[in-house]
């Protein structure tokens, strides 16, 4: 019985991508339910690692070092077989991050996309990485891997994601690896949130006291909907940052958020979106654009009384 039937399944939790100093549990599952297993690291010529020790249920590895990176397999205990052990499991690659300078991650055409569109996530660095890896937070699957292209002293890889569906929204990071150490990855890039819009009904956006105001007059933009959105996001054309506020239920059974913009100094076109707490990176259709005009003495910047969120953090829950 050396076929798939006899083959255990090796998995890692919480992830196969582990930072230096982190811990990872290797679990050897077998349909016949053995508890005892042996671990092998493939770059050690299939010799059992950890001095041939036998483990029960799971083995916790850590604090991990670059030397822990590599391909692992397990064999389960089968007392009545000729060898006493099952066939080797699937290969499991453990990648250890934090070994080189972080690359940069960009989204083309941008991180805010409509359902069904395709986005290119470009990972690049001035370190000559041979491979780039793209990982979405919260999924246990192995990261996508691409060979780096080197041009003008920069190595880069373009990951195509799409057509976009809610399941693909989330926080992405990329890593690089150098030749001869394929599973010793760099520090992660800064996180990049990919937001998918157009999934739910659009909210309405209005301005108080109105869309045309005197310079210096206080302006508040209100985003509301009959849909029970948890969060509203307000964006201004030409600005990378969005602001977000928790939706508040109103007596007229709408859900609303009021964004105070402070004293008006110059105009702009605003849009708002709604989202639910369970899927913070999946937004509604955009509200109709609202043009705020300022009469009087416009200046070059509008003060921001609510701190705008960074390019990342959109996909975190708002507490």
């Amino acid at each position: 019985l050396m076929g798939g039937q006899d083959k255990p399944f090796l998995s890692a939790r919480p992830s196969t991508v582990v930072p230096r100093g982190g811990h990872v549990a290797l679990q050897c599952h077998y349909r016949r339910g053995f508890n005892n297993f042996m671990l092998y690291k493939e770059d050690r010529s299939h010799v059992p690692i950890f001095h041939g020790r036998i483990f029960q249920e799971s083995f916790i590895m850590g604090p991990v070092t670059p030397a822990h990176a590599g391909t692992y397999r397990c064999r389960g205990s089968r007392p009545h077989s000729l060898t006493g052990w099952s066939a080797p499991s699937n290969p499991l690659v453990i990648m250890v991050t934090g070994n080189h300078r972080k690359p940069s991650l960009l989204a083309h055409p941008g991180p805010l996309l409509k359902s069904g569109e395709t986005v290119i996530l470009q990972c690049w660095s001035d370190v000559m990485f041979e491979h780039f890896f793209l990982h979405r937070e919260g999924i246990s699957e192995d990261p996508s891997r691409l060979v780096g292209q080197i041009h003008d002293g920069v190595s880069k890889a373009n990951f195509s994601i799409g057509p976009l569906m809610p399941v693909l929204a989330g926080t992405y990071r990329c890593y690089g690896s150098v030749p001869h150490s394929p599973y010793q990855l760099s520090a992660p890039s800064d996180p990049l949130d990919i937001v998918i819009t157009g999934l739910y009904e659009k909210p309405s956006l209005s301005a108080q006291p109105g869309p045309t105001v005197q310079a210096g007059e206080n302006v508040t933009l209100s985003c509301s909907s009959w849909s029970s959105y948890d969060i509203y996001h307000l964006s201004r054309e030409g600005e990378a940052h969005e602001r977000r506020l928790r939706a508040v239920p109103k007596v007229n059974r709408t859900f609303q958020a009021d964004f105070p913009l402070g004293p008006a100094t110059h105009g702009g076109t605003y849009r708002c979106f709604g989202s639910f707490r369970a899927l913070p990176c999946v937004w509604s259709n955009s509200s109709d654009p609202l043009l705020v005009s300022v009469t009087g003495n416009p200046s070059s910047s509008w003060p921001s009384p609510t701190e705008p969120s960074s390019k990342s953090g959109i996909c975190r829950h708002l507490h």
Epitope: P14, V18, P19, R20, G21, G22, H23, A25, I60, E137
Partner: antibody
């Protein structure tokens, strides 16, 4: 029972070095990593780095990379941390702490702390 | 590096009250979080590990909760001996950074 006993307080001049010790008892010294944490007067806690006594592998917080050297003597179950080129900013209490076992381990035992004062 | 943002930095409460301290990680730390209590001139002592598990000998009025990036330490029915400084710390990769601390003072 598990105990981590650190060496006594030290007063050093700027530019000097100091070696702080942490003697472990009540467990198998080589089975756990030993970590060092610093606390400047009136400040919070900062992780410095760790040593795996069984292999000698060390890892440092980048902030302290050129400041500290961690070693371990398995025959006496003692971990050491040497601080070099001392400056007044290095005045702090230095703790050793054992990292526990498990998938989500904490620092389960701490030394009593060693006060290092750098003053001319 | 993962940043740990602890709030509030100080807190006044009375004996018998319930207090909550929060810690936010700059990225998912998969419950690799511990809470410590430190009294003046003493080493920190472990209260909670793995975000929710109470360390041996810690009174049940202490509890930890949270997952992902957001974690909470709650102390029910404050006792006089609970007035101290509390720190969170993550273990999801080096450097194992601490939160800035919360000083719990008697009102």
């Amino acid at each position: 029972q598990v105990q981590l006993v650190q060496s006594g307080a030290e007063v050093k001049k700027p530019g000097a070095s100091v070696k702080v010790s942490c003697k472990a008892s009540g467990y198998t010294f080589t089975s756990y990593t030993m970590h060092w944490v610093r606390q400047a007067p009136g400040q919070g806690l900062e992780w410095i780095g760790y040593i795996n006594p069984s292999s000698g592998y060390t890892e440092n917080n980048r902030k302290f990379k050129d400041k500290t050297t961690m070693t371990a003597d398995t025959s006496t179950s003692t971990a050491y941390m040497e601080l070099s080129s001392l400056r007044s900013e290095d005045t702090a209490v230095y703790y050793c702490a054992r990292l526990g076992k498990g998938l989500l381990p904490p620092f389960d035992y701490w030394g009593q702390g060693t006060t290092v004062t750098v003053s001319s | 590096d993962i940043q740990m943002t602890q709030s509030p930095s100080s807190l006044s409460a009375s004996v018998g009250e319930t207090v909550t301290i929060t810690c936010r990680a700059s990225e998912n730390i998969y419950s690799n979080l511990a809470w410590y209590q430190q009294k003046q001139g003493k080493a920190p002592q472990l209260l909670v590990y793995a975000a929710t598990n109470l360390a041996d000998g810690v009174p049940s009025r202490f509890s930890g909760s949270g997952s992902g990036t957001q974690y909470t330490l709650t102390i029910n029915s404050l006792q006089p001996e609970d007035f101290a400084t509390y720190y969170c710390q993550h273990f999801w990769g080096t450097p194992y950074t601490f939160g800035g601390g919360t000083k719990l003072e008697i009102k």
